[in-house]
Amino acid sequence: TLNSVLNSNAIKNLPPPLGGAAGHPGSAVSAAPGILYPGGNKYQTIDNYQPYPCAEDEECGTDEYCASPTRGGDAGVQICLACRKRRKRCMRHAMCCPGNYCKNGICVSSDQNHFRGEIEETITESFGNDHSTLDGYSRRTTLSSKMYHTKGQEGSVCLRSSDCASGLCCARHFWSKICKPVLKEGQVCTKHRRKGSHGLEIFQRCYCGEGLSCRIQKDHHQASNSSRLHTCQRH
């Protein structure tokens, strides 16, 4: 059903605009400084302007992040925006393009040439509104991690899912993020009922694997108090 379409916490598949645009919930896509938007009859072509609404970074492509396109914009209205290249300003790791991470507000290279052996990496994790580091849930923690040429194996520290090997995703574990297995059929999954509720998990599960969706387990023998258990199921 469209539960997986409209009630899941995963949005994807839309080439973002150049810069992207979104207004308030139910509002028009409107202009903001430094970003290309449609105004009046002046729309971008289909290849350039396909705003994709999102709730979290995982719902966008690997070269994108999810945020409000306007500075100080409504956090509840976000779209997929193009990732930021090296030396561009950032607030969190996901804003930086693959191969980079956010350090002191600037996207810097995470290339092996720049980091050898063990490095001290400061990771800022935000909870609630995942794109802001100014909320009450922000926490800084210093992690000792190794930068590898190969993709991260299970348990490896990561910044984003693209850092992890096939079959793994980057998910929170306490105050850091590590590579965890993508969920298989029958495994318990987390169905986010509220936008942003994923930000409160300190032991975050991966999403269900391809061809699976997180749905209520239909087991008539279950007690009523556990009837809301969700598992990865095929369609």
């Epitope: 949005i11 994807k12 839309l14 709730a55 719902e59 997929c80």
Partner: nanobody
Framework: EVQLVESGGGLVQPGGSLRLSCAAS????????MGWFRQAPGKEREFVAA????????IYADSVKGRFTISADNSKNTAYLQMNSLKPEDTAVYYC?????????????????WGQGTLVTVSS
């Protein structure tokens, strides 16, 4: 692959209303956003409206704000575009779009799959 079939288009007078429907089938478990785009004769295809999966966020183009409403019915795997106060300039082929893929499946950009379109003509 996702299949999208639009319906509800037709001829309507200025000021009138139409409700477009988009039935999704196939790999719908991968869909996480739905949108509507349109293409008028001799013009580029343009964004109209979109709705997110997680928060039910809806966004609209300036030209349709306050007149069009995007929604979806989970039980019917269908998205809708309610179009009120139609104007002649709204005349176009309207395409349903399903957001399918993204970071979860290694896509560099989130992207839409497209339906074949349904023609809306606003004329007196």
């Amino acid at each position: 692959e996702v299949q999208l079939v639009e319906s509800g288009g037709g001829l309507v007078q200025p000021g009138g209303s139409l409700r477009l429907s988009c039935a999704a089938s196939g790999s719908i478990e991968n869909i996480n956003a739905m949108g509507w785009f349109r293409q008028a004769p001799g013009k580029e295809r343009e964004f109209v409206a979109a709705i997110s999966s997680g928060g039910g966020i809806t966004i609209y183009a300036d030209s349709v704000k306050g007149r069009f409403t995007i929604s979806a019915d989970n039980s019917k795997n269908t998205a809708y575009l309610q179009m009120n106060s139609l104007k002649p300039e709204d005349t176009a082929v309207y395409y349903c779009a399903a957001g399918n893929g993204g970071r979860k499946y290694g896509h560099h950009r989130a992207r839409y799959d497209w339906g074949q379109g349904t023609l809306v003509t606003v004329s007196s």
